[in-house]
């Protein structure tokens, strides 16, 4: 009878995945361990069939239609380990006859996800399971936890509510867990942590809430364990007290409403009063903390789309193990980290998108620093060496502020630019919008940078040598949107540049390449090239995989080279249907169309064809 | 530690010639644009000559065009002052110094005394 | 006669506050370029003080300040002690000359 079940089955494992079934199949072979049902339409679980598969260890009925459990339909079940019953409809009347799940005494997770399962008829569904370790109670209607809501659930580590309507956890909601160790209560509806004790709790997800403070519990002796929080998406007024969090590594509050303190705090004893915003800051761990220095250990701290006007001295000050800092979209005027040892491992630090005029790093601070994002500012006369002062850093983004390139030695200045002249470790820098008049000689020596752009600044005037010392090292150059009608660099010399952007100028002329180099991608396009030679393109046909040239005034006749390639399909030309060429009497058509008799006609022989 | 040390000046006739040197240390010599300045003694500072990192580009003061040279050897990390047709008037105290990207001069030697005198 | 001007002697009390003046031309400090201030203690290299107008090197106290408008610049030096009595230097490029000037040098006197 197997034949009648379409079901695959591998070893003991069975899939009857989205077959249509309005019940379980009862032709599947007895010793089954692994049962997939989901995506099909059974109404109702009835110890039989599904008692006959007592080997069954995993079994996925999700997202079917289910509304009715038969009492003791798993208590045949005796190894069963994971269950899911998400996306179905338990909470229609008939699924809470008496016993709901009934004990479930060896499973270990167990998913009822999706189910519009409400506070109350979520108790009389749960039953004794003394193995749970992981619980999904996500996507369902639960408006409120109380102390009798897990019970019998000893051994639970993982506990998932996201995206239910919790306004009460009511005190001692989670104190039969004593192992509860990661919660998820992202996307509900809580505005207050005001009493935090789950001292063993590890991972804690309290995004996208309506939070409005988060308090410890005043436990002097108490060791928390949590290392990751999550408070993104609430509106929280001030930086949550974390003292006692000693732990903590991830700390994510972004998307709130926090400002920090610019004053010291009022009072220097207990909780700060949120007025002063010092509810705020990690400040001072209480007396009986191990630790002595909160949020010491912390390696990733979001703090981006947020009101912060000012980062107080003292706020960095604890941050030792802080890899990454994020404080984009914020209102930040200024920026300091001067002192020596200050953000000592910060890896990765974004400033972008906040109102920066000015940004002072000290010769010795963020010394482990590689990554600088700082585009939407409003920078401009920054201290000199602000960057060559960076040890260690290789990616530089500076795109949209006003920052002026200081030129090399024998062309100094002019006051108020910024040096990268010897910074050793950048690879990727970008000023992109800077409003760059003139780009001096020896702009970039001994800064072997990869990646240059220096895109939308109109006007900018490159200077002979301004790209000098790149030659060995850029692989990627974008010029893009300057007006530039002349390209005083000498391109064939920069001999592992793969991507060369000169959209958006008024070229219309190329240096030769007349020898192989690594060009891959060459954007042309919106400029006034009439003519591609082949003199000057040859050394291109090896490497070249992309040329753009849309928008360009082309010749139909004298770009052999091109129809060449358009012809032979060595390089893959953009709008290979549209790229119009004209003739002498501006006759527009498709370059691709063009004939070599087209061009012999009065005395225009195509010498290149 | 960056340290500069000159050494080669003295005691020589006008019309005579002198040779400078200027050993460099606890820097990347060859990253570096180098000058040399000069104190008479009792006046100012003034600047004699610079060369660009590689040694390409070499610029000159009015006073001693044509007839000092500067040249370095960044396999030596030295940096050289030749000094031809000497006259009383270059007299003075001369200091090698590195440049940074701004042009100012960051590091100083200590400087070796140069006398034209017959 | 050098290319940037400055008083040959300036003097003031300790704690007080002094400034020395640097005035160029439109090919120097009034084309833009950049000024740079050093001190020279007796019988000692000058030392750099003040790069790019306003800029202090670490170690040197924020009791020196430069500022620069025009064809001019300025070193300033509040609660005078008596350890900076020294000749004090500008120095910017030229753009005519080709070439670095320095100022006269001023010799600063604690009184």
């Known amino acids: 009878h197997q034949d009648k079940v379409p079901c695959k089955m591998v070893d003991k494992k069975v899939s009857c995945q989205v077959l249509g079934l309005l019940q379980v199949p009862s032709v599947l072979p007895p010793d089954t361990e692994t049962l997939d049902l989901s995506g099909n339409q059974l109404r109702s679980i009835l110890a039989s069939p599904l008692g006959f598969y007592t080997a069954l260890r995993h079994l996925d009925l999700s997202t079917n239609e289910i509304s009715f459990l038969q009492p003791g339909a798993f208590q045949a079940l005796t190894h069963l380990e994971h269950l899911s019953l998400a996306h179905n409809r338990l909470a229609m009347a008939t699924a809470l006859s008496a016993g709901g799940l009934g004990p479930l005494p060896r499973v270990t997770s167990l998913d009822l996800s999706g189910n519009s399962l409400y506070s109350g008829l979520l108790e009389r569904l749960l039953g004794e399971a003394p193995s749970l370790h992981t619980l999904s109670l996500a996507e369902n209607s639960l408006t409120r936890l109380t102390r009798h809501t897990f019970r019998d659930m000893p051994a639970l580590e993982q506990l998932d509510l996201h995206s239910n309507v919790l306004m009460d956890i009511e005190d001692g909601a989670f104190e039969g867990l004593p192992r509860l160790t990661h919660l998820n209560l992202s996307r509900n509806s809580l505005t207050c942590i005001s009493d935090f004790s789950l001292q063993q709790l590890r991972v804690l997800d309290l995004s996208c809430n309506s939070i409005e403070a988060f308090q410890t519990a005043s436990q002097p002796q108490a060791e928390f364990q949590l290392t990751w929080l999550d408070l993104r998406e609430n509106k929280l007024l001030h930086f949550p007290d974390l003292a006692a969090l000693p732990r903590l590594i991830y700390l994510n509050l972004s998307n709130n409403l926090i400002r920090l303190p610019t004053g010291p705090p009022q009072d220097s004893k207990g909780i700060h009063a949120p007025s002063e915003g010092w509810s705020a800051l990690p400040l001072s761990a209480p007396s009986g903390n191990a630790s002595g220095r909160p949020l010491s250990q912390l390696l990733n701290l979001d703090l981006s789309y947020n009101e912060i006007e000012l980062i107080p001295d003292s706020f960095l000050e604890h941050l030792t193990s802080l890899c990454f800092l994020n404080l984009s979209r914020n209102c930040l005027r200024t920026f300091e980290a001067r002192r020596l040892g200050s953000l000592p491992c910060l890896m990765l630090l974004d400033l972008s998108h906040n109102a920066l005029e000015t940004l002072e790093l000290g010769a010795r601070a963020l010394g482990s620093l590689r990554t600088l994002l700082l585009q939407g500012n409003a920078l401009r006369d920054l201290p000199p060496y602000t960057f060559a002062n960076l040890a260690s850093l290789q990616r530089l983004n500076l795109q949209g502020n006003r920052v002026s390139p200081c030129g090399g030695p024998d062309e100094p200045g002019p006051s108020g630019c910024v040096a990268f002249s010897g910074i050793t470790s950048l690879r990727s820098l970008s000023l992109v919008d800077n409003e760059i008049e003139l780009l001096r000689a020896g702009a970039f020596l001994h800064t072997p940078l990869t990646e240059l752009d220096l895109s939308s600044n109109p006007g900018l005037e490159v200077a002979t040598g301004a790209l000098g010392g790149l030659e060995a090292s850029l692989e990627v150059l974008a010029l893009q949107g300057n007006g530039l009608m002349v390209l005083q660099v000498d391109l064939p010399c920069f001999i592992c540049l793969k991507r060369l952007n000169l959209a958006e100028n008024r070229l219309s002329h190329l240096p030769a390449w007349t020898q192989a180099v690594s060009l891959e991608v060459l954007d042309l396009r919106n400029n006034s090239f009439s003519l591609l030679p082949g003199s000057a393109m040859g050394g291109l046909e090896t490497s070249l995989r992309r040329l753009y040239l849309q928008g360009n005034p082309l010749s139909c006749c004298g770009n052999g080279w091109l129809a060449a390639q358009l012809h032979q399909g060595r390089v893959d030309v953009d709008a290979t249907q549209d790229l119009i060429c004209r003739f002498s009497s501006q006759e527009e058509v498709s370059l691709s169309h063009v004939r070599p008799e087209d061009c012999e006609k009065g005395g225009l022989k195509n010498i290149n064809l | 530690e960056v340290q500069l040390l000159e050494s080669g000046g003295g005691l020589v006739q006008p019309g005579g010639s002198l040779r400078l040197s200027c050993a460099a240390s606890?820097?990347?010599?060859?990253?570096?644009?180098m000058s040399w300045i000069r104190q008479a003694p009792g006046k100012g500072l003034e600047w004699v000559s610079g060369?660009?990192?590689?040694?390409?580009?070499?610029h000159y003061a009015d006073s001693v065009k044509g007839r000092f040279t500067i040249s370095r050897d960044n396999s030596k990390n030295t940096l050289y002052l030749q000094m031809n047709s000497l006259r009383a008037e270059d007299t003075a105290v001369y200091y090698c110094?590195?440049?940074?990207?701004?042009?100012?001069?960051?590091?100083w030697g200590q400087g070796t005394l140069v006398t034209v005198s017959s | 006669q050098s290319v940037l001007t400055q008083p040959p002697s300036a003097s003031g009390t300790p704690g007080q506050r002094v400034t020395i003046s640097c005035t160029g031309s439109?090919?120097?400090?009034?084309?833009?370029?950049?000024v740079h201030w050093y001190q020279q203690l007796p019988g000692t290299a000058p030392k750099l003080l003040i790069y790019?107008?306003?800029n202090r090197p670490s170690g040197v106290p924020d009791r020196f300040s430069g500022s620069k408008s025009g064809t001019s610049a300025s070193l300033a030096i509040s609660g005078l002690r008596s350890e900076d009595e020294a000749d004090y230097y500008c120095?910017?490029?030229?753009?005519?000359?080709?070439?670095?000037?320095f100022g006269g040098g001023t010799k600063l006197t604690v009184l």
């Open positions: 110094a590195r440049q940074r990207q701004l042009a100012e001069f960051d590091y």
């Open positions: 606890g820097f990347t010599f060859s990253d570096y644009y």
């Open positions: 060369v660009s990192w590689n040694g390409s580009r070499t």
């Open positions: 439109s090919s120097n400090i009034g084309a833009g370029y950049v």
């Open positions: 790019a107008d306003t």
């Open positions: 120095q910017s490029y030229d753009s005519s000359l080709r070439g670095w000037v």
